[in-house]
Amino acid sequence: DSSKWVFEHPETLYAWEGACVWIPCTYRALDGDLESFILFHNPEYNKNTSKFDGTRLYESTKDGKVPSEQKRVQFLGDKNKNCTLSIHPVHLNDSGQLGLRMESKTEKWMERIHLNVSERPFPPHIQLPPEIQESQEVTLTCLLNFSCYGYPIQLQWLLEGVPMRQAAVTSTSLTIKSVFTRSELKFSPQWSHHGKIVTCQLQDADGKFLSNDTVQLNVKHTPKLEIKVTPSDAIVREGDSVTMTCEVSSSNPEYTTVSWLKDGTSLKKQNTFTLNLREVTKDQSGKYCCQVSNDVGPGRSEEVFLQVQYAPEPSTVQILHSPAVEGSQVEFLCMSLANPLPTNYTWYHNGKEMQGRTEEKVHIPKILPWHAGTYSCVAENILGTGQRGPGAELDVQYPPKKVTTVIQNPMPIREGDTVTLSCNYNSSNPSVTRYEWKPHGAWEEPSLGVLKIQNVGWDNTTIACAACNSWCSWASPVALNVQYAPRDVRVRKIKPLSEIHSGNSVSLQCDFSSSHPKEVQFFWEKNGRLLGKESQLNFDSISPEDAGSYSCWVNNSIGQTASKAWTLEVLYAPRRLRVSMSPGDQVMEGKSATLTCESDANPPVSHYTWFDWNNQSLPYHSQKLRLEPVKVQHSGAYWCQGTNSVGKGRSPLSTLTVYYSPETIGRR
């Protein structure tokens, strides 16, 4: 209806004596802003005066001033939208109807709100889910139709009077739609919570009790059972009787069926709360429990372990591990079904009793080949001694033992011979399947464990073989001791350290790298001529004539070896210089004369100097001095000087005679 003011607020607000009430409220006036506001308690319309009668709790004046006695009631609204109110503290006699008398310039309205104030704090309300099952998380909700900014409260959960310290989530609502405080508790109830009292306690800011609501938990759960057995220790001998009784300590809802299980399997035709076992056999040993079901599901009791005692059965031996590797540890386990467990054991190795071995396990920390064989045992308990079973075989595996490399050839072995070796061993488990040789070579193995070396090398010093099964065992290497002629024979100059100059003392050494046998002889030769039989060839004062090609030979009983030819070079200053003339020492003027400086030098002459009869050096430095045309004045004695890196040499004088030509004579 467009002729109405529009208000939104909770229909009824709840509080208690001494608390407060907060009234969320919104409105929309028909026209303009609010000019006057009066809050009535239980207003009644007076037709005579056309006004409302009742207690005025709050009154706003045009100037907006509020009388001091109205401090308890506060209008927190505004002139066009908000009509929120607060009463603090609220009293019991505030209960009833609050009338909000609103006036604008032209319109008036009375809005009614119910206020319910109780003498004591009213209780919250617990809401439970329709069904609660054990171990399934549920949310418990506690709702209180109260919230006020000026009066802090809290909702606390208790279980059997003790605070529950699971995390509860508290929320408050102070809206035009609803005013409440709510606490939600997530909780996983156990069967033992069935029938327990849960309390939601309303508390003041100091945690003190104001009011509460309680509920009794109805936790649906499978039957909870207790099993009792006679005899109580559940230990009997074959032929005895046993009684088991199943008691239901709790079930919600009531149980419907009963059954018994042995080792997890249902026992046929056993559907009562008592299980009677008469004249038990050892096969009836095992774990027994009773199972009782209700609509939630089956519940099982704890297991009772029934032990039917009997003497040990024939024993078997378990070996950890066979085959065993020599040096490893091995454990033997004597297995014999018996109840009670055997207290004593007797062990046998190859039928012979093993002294001092009375335990269920025999541990050998380091297995040796002689430990191989058949192991058996006998178990004994308070009811008797068992029989010896068939036993178990221990296979001890080990690498080939005492491996040797044997040379089949007659000794000594010479370079180039064919050598045959064999690889021998004493024992092996498992059998030898292959052989290895060191060093590796392109050698033949004509049969397993035999090696043939064709054309044996001088440097084949040692050979070792390995015999292999799952492991390889290496023999100590054997020396072939191959004999050979001296090797790497070469000439080495010992002195001088630098180049050889004429007149030096010179020593040459005949070197070789190896020889077998070691006893050797030396020979020196030059140009096919034997010079000496020592390892060294010595020259006290070397001359250029000693230069040439030298070789040395070294021989032993196997053969002889020559060095490469070694060239001995002797350096000397120019010598035997002479001047030769061409065409001769007498030349006619006008012709050509060539003077040549001839010499013997090592290294060759690098520089020539020419001199005339006055010992004047001429401006010519080559080996030949060419005079063309030759003049009579050129007649005279000439000599030359040659220089190399070692020194200088000079020639004797050679005379050149230049005679007049017939023309010159004719002119005279």
Epitope: G18, P163, D204, K208
Partner: antibody
Amino acid sequence: QVQLQQPGAELVKPGASVKLSCKTSGYTFTIYWMQWVKQRPGRGLEWIGRIDPHSGDTHYNENFTTKVTLTVDETSNTAYMHLSGLTSEDSAVYYCARRDYSYYVLDYWGQGTSVTVSS
Amino acid sequence: DVVLTQTPLSLPVSLGDQASISCRSSQSLVHINGDTYLHWYLQKPGQSPKLLIYTVFNRFSGVPDRFSGSGSGTDFTLKISRVEAEDLGAYFCSQSTHVPYTFGGGTKLEIK
């Protein structure tokens, strides 16, 4: 049995701070609010404030709001009171006490820590 | 804050005598829930206070029955029917109805 253990004494310089501990045993720490009380010779007992060990929520006596901070360590079941800006007026014995959740009474008290503020 | 006034300040007694201590509150200690949170403690020299009586008249566990509490609203009394040597010390009343909690000034029970 319920026990609240406090160190015997603390000597502090003026202006400094001190953190007093109260180690509990023999009960579920988070269920009971922990209260702290001050006692000066000839001045009686003064309630300082309380803490809920479960939520950490605190409430202080207005006379102590700027002086005191209450905390707890759930893992070690220990409550702490931090006193700052110490003066000679803060020299006193400080007790921690457990508040019962049904009758709101301080049912078990620690032996108290004597704090002396002196340069 | 609620003020608790204890009288007398000092109470000299002979062993075997009855003793009575009064505690007056500046305002009612009845909580909105109807309970009255007025308690009594005994503090022996060098020790912490020990709870004797809670919520006016309930004896704490292990407290002998010679101790009794009574009162309502603003006036409360602690009585010791036959004083024994171990009862000597300072007695305090305390309220936990209003926050902050407050304590009386104490009454020293001593041998005459």
